[in-house]
């Protein structure tokens, strides 16, 4: 671990004098001397710290531009910036959240492992023998063949990843 | 008044160390940072290192941090500044000063020389 | 690291003169500098501390100007008292740096 420094936590070293840093929230205005305190004020609407400090100046929240797809997910204060999230049917293009893309839909012969959030685009798997999708969607999974057999029926045409089998009745043997 | 007294002249062998104190006097030793620097003949003054006396934490000049230690003893008021693996480039005076917005009290300075 | 220059080295004045010593930083240390006096028998004094406040003591003779990089000491109305060599130093930024000093003599 790295040796303690001359200011304790939640100081700062300037000038040859350990002064407080400020709280979330708040921002410096003046430095401690050797006669006063830090003087720190508390940030504007629509801005926010979220760290002890010694800026001048408070971040801007962030803007969840609509027309970007965006939307609030969680108002920003004085402490916290603004989340942003994806209208529904979209999701974000980076972690930051920036802008959003439309879900991707899983082709035929694909189905959706996992759907789609805010934050992350839907992931397709191909169909297993045994299971078929013929639709493009982002939220149909592959669905198994159907079971002549339940059904007192036999295959008649063998199921693929995109179709399903097709079942027709046994064959009557001929007296 | 605030006060810095230092400890005499040292004249030491290449490669040893050399311990300088700083006592202080006049004030609460360990609400003020105590800075220390170097000056060699006829020339400027260079930063060693600062320490705050009642935590003991303490920040060096990154130039010489390998060979300085900076302790001090709040039960005596006296700071410290030991340095070591001494070279004929160490000889100069060496000053502790208080903190407190810029380096506010000094001590007369402490005249290391090594040689051989 | 922060470089603090004073340009004149060495100047000579009359008693009673005005006398400005300059220092500029390599970068932007907002007011955090500090003047210093090292008399010729090596001691050494704060004068001004934040570019401007006159520290406890000082005669007001004494002052101090300057914001960001270019930073002024005045002495005014110069006695023989204040024979000695002038230091800037800042405090913006570890390392703490000094100015090369300006030593000031009597014509």
């Known amino acids: 671990p790295e040796p303690p420094t001359a200011c304790r936590e939640k100081q700062y070293l300037i000038n040859s004098q350990c002064c407080s840093l400020c709280q979330p929230g708040q921002k410096l205005v003046s430095d401690c001397t050797e006669f006063t305190e830090t003087e720190c004020l508390p940030c504007g609407e629509s801005e926010f710290l979220d760290t002890w400090n010694r800026e001048t100046h408070c971040h801007q929240h962030k803007y969840c531009d609509p027309n970007l797809g965006l939307r609030v997910q969680q108002k920003g204060t004085s402490e916290t910036d603004t989340i942003c999230t994806c209208e529904e049917g979209w999701h974000c293009t980076s972690e930051a959240c920036e802008s959003c893309v439309l879900h991707r839909s899983c082709s035929p012969g694909f189905g959706v492992k996992q759907i789609a959030t805010g934050v992350s685009d839907t992931i397709c798997e191909p169909c297993p023998v045994g299971f078929f999708s013929n639709v493009s969607s982002a939220f149909e999974k592959c669905h198994p063949w159907t079971s002549c057999e339940t059904k007192d029926l036999v295959v008649q045409q063998a199921g693929t990843n995109k179709t399903d089998v097709v079942c027709g009745p046994q064959d009557r043997l001929r007296a | 008044q605030v006060q810095l007294q230092q400890s005499g002249a040292e004249l030491v062998r290449p490669g040893t160390s050399v311990k300088v104190s700083c006592k202080a006097s006049?004030?609460?030793?360990?609400?003020?940072?105590i800075e220390w620097a170097k000056q060699r003949p006829g020339q400027g003054l260079e930063w060693i290192g600062v320490i705050n006396p009642g935590s003991g934490g303490s920040n060096y000049n990154e130039k010489i941090k390998d060979r300085a230690t900076l302790t001090a003893d709040k039960s005596s008021s006296t700071a410290y500044m030991q340095l070591s693996s001494l070279t004929s480039e160490d000889s100069a005076v060496y000053f502790c000063?208080?903190?407190?917005?810029?380096?506010?009290?000094w001590g007369q300075g402490t005249l290391v020389t090594v040689s051989a | 690291e922060i470089q603090l220059t004073q340009t004149t080295s060495s100047l000579s004045a009359s008693l009673g003169d005005r006398v400005t010593i300059s220092c500029r930083a390599s970068?932007?240390?907002?007011?955090?500098l500090n003047w210093y006096q090292q008399k010729p028998d090596g001691t050494i004094k704060l004068l001004l501390n934040f570019a401007s406040r006159l520290h406890s003591g000082v005669p007001s003779r004494f002052s101090g100007s300057g914001s960001g990089t270019d930073f002024f000491l005045t002495i005014s109305n110069l006695e023989q008292d204040d024979i000695a060599t002038y230091f800037c130093q800042q405090g913006s930024t570890l390392p703490w740096t000094f100015g090369g000093g300006t030593k000031l003599e009597i014509k």
């Open positions: 970068q932007d240390i907002s007011n955090y």
């Open positions: 000063a208080r903190g407190g917005g810029g380096f506010t009290y």
């Open positions: 006049g004030y609460a030793f360990s609400d003020y940072l």
